[in-house]
Interface confidence: low
């Protein structure tokens, strides 16, 4: 099938980085500056993505691949392919409708993005609090009195992160 197609369609011979130029007897022409074709047989080249403003270039555009953007310092990527940049907050804060807000008592965030998550409830595992939590750090759970035997583990991993959003319907 491929062989038949290439006999019928000269454009299928045009490699990535070129396009099949209808104005020039369907010969393979290189993509013009600031454009690319990532697959063969293209009849046009795509315009390169430009990383402007809060976006900065992570990977330059080439004749065969689009540019890739990331975000300037103080921002992080959101959206598929970093289509948006969201401002960072400090550790101990979360981004809300009204900007960066400190984590409420009993919650923490150890990153510049994401949400404040509840401290681990040590007592659910029969443990005690070894180190108190802060806005930036989870509590550290220590062994319960019954666990104080040789070889007992003294720290438990933090609980899974609470997912953001509001209460389910």
């Amino acid at each position: 099938f491929e062989r038949t197609r290439s006999l019928q369609d000269p454009c299928s011979n045009c490699p990535a980085g070129t396009f099949c130029d209808n104005n020039r007897n369907q010969i393979c022409s290189p993509c013009p500056p600031n454009s690319f074709s990532s697959a063969g047989g293209q009849r046009t080249c795509d315009i390169c993505r430009q990383c402007k403003g809060v976006f900065r270039t992570r990977k330059e555009c080439s004749s065969t691949s689009n540019a890739e953007c990331d975000c300037t310092p103080g921002f992080h990527c959101l959206g598929a392919g970093c289509s948006m940049c969201e401002q960072d907050c400090k550790q101990g804060q979360e981004l809300t409708k009204k900007g960066c807000k400190d984590c409420c008592f009993g919650t923490f965030n150890d990153q510049k993005r994401g949400i404040c998550r509840p401290w681990t409830n040590c007592s659910l595992d029969g443990k005690s609090v070894l180190v108190n939590g802060t806005k930036e750090r989870d509590v550290v759970c220590g062994p319960s009195p019954a666990d104080l035997s040789p070889g007992a583990s003294s720290v438990t991993p933090p609980a899974p992160a609470r997912e953001p959003g509001h209460s389910p319907q």
Epitope: A80, E86, C116, E163
Partner: antibody, heavy 129, light 110 residues
Framework: EVQLLESGGGLVQPGGSLRLSCAAS????????MTWIRQAPGKGLEWVSS????????YYADSVKGRFTISRDNSKNTLYLQMNSLRAEDTAVYYC??????????????????????WGQGTLVTVSS | QSVLTQPPSASGTPGQRVTISCSGS????????VSWYQQLPGTAPKLLIY???NRPSGVPDRFSGSKSGTSASLAISGLRSEDEADYYC???????????FGGGTKLTVL
């Protein structure tokens, strides 16, 4: 390439059922809120349902509550919409759309600030006898 | 009946600047951010503006969004024939507790 591809639409009689699927590729599906939006012929956009990245939070429009069920399988990078007790007014093109997982908690879905940045091509559902 | 109100149609000639309005209320536009979507004939909607005035990467700077009180607007400068499409505004409604859209504006380039 970032892509959403819907399937499962078709002609169904009133009272019947359909299951729509939306296959995601080119991005980390499990990081994204997913939404179904529909558009009746010649009409505007209508939000149908949303589901959070790990299915903890699910929302429905009043017009479909109790009849439609949204779900996702992150291992298969696929979103679903099970539609039961279909009515003529459910006739529409159904789009799936993605939104980065929200940052910020409380009674406001901060994620909506970012709109819906990737859309599928849509699948037509026709409910008619 | 859409929660947000848009004019059903708008038009302009190539090179002109056109503005599309989106009117809402205290529970939606005033208290939340507005997104704008472009839907070219026979295709899916595309995000054009988010957070009232931010353009996703790849959207030309001819498109700009703004918000004041309970209204938002989308401005398109240097109008081109390829801008002929339906445009929708969308936001969150705190009272309805769901996303809401305008009814759409059909833009014709004369």
């Amino acid at each position: 390439e970032v892509q959403l591809l819907e399937s499962g639409g078709g002609l169904v009689q009133p009272g019947g059922s359909l299951r729509l699927s939306c296959a995601a590729s080119g991005f980390t599906f499990s990081d994204y809120y997913m939404t179904w939006i529909r558009q009746a012929p010649g009409k505007g956009l209508e939000w149908v349902s949303s589901i959070s990245s790990s299915s903890s939070y699910i929302y429905y429009a009043d017009s479909v509550k109790g009849r439609f069920t949204i779900s996702r399988d992150n291992s298969k990078n696929t979103l679903y919409l099970q539609m039961n007790s279909l009515r003529a007014e459910d006739t529409a093109v159904y789009y799936c759309a993605s939104t980065q997982t929200p940052y910020g908690s409380g009674n406001y879905p901060i994620y909506y600030y970012y709109g819906m940045d990737v859309w599928g091509q849509g699948t037509l559902v026709t409910v008619s006898s | 009946q859409s929660v947000l109100t848009q004019p059903p149609s708008a038009s302009g000639t190539p090179g002109q600047r056109v503005t599309i309005s989106c009117s809402g209320s205290r529970s939606n536009i005033r208290s939340n951010s507005v997104s704008w979507y472009q839907q070219l004939p026979g295709t899916a909607p595309k995000l054009l503006i988010y957070g009232n005035s931010n353009r996703p990467s790849g959207v030309p700077d001819r498109f700009s969004g703004s918000k004041s009180g309970t209204s938002a607007s989308l401005a398109i400068s240097g109008l081109r024939s390829e801008d002929e499409a339906d445009y929708y505004c969308g936001t969150w409604d705190d009272r309805l507790n769901r996303p809401v859209f305008g009814g759409g504006t059909k833009l014709t380039v004369l």
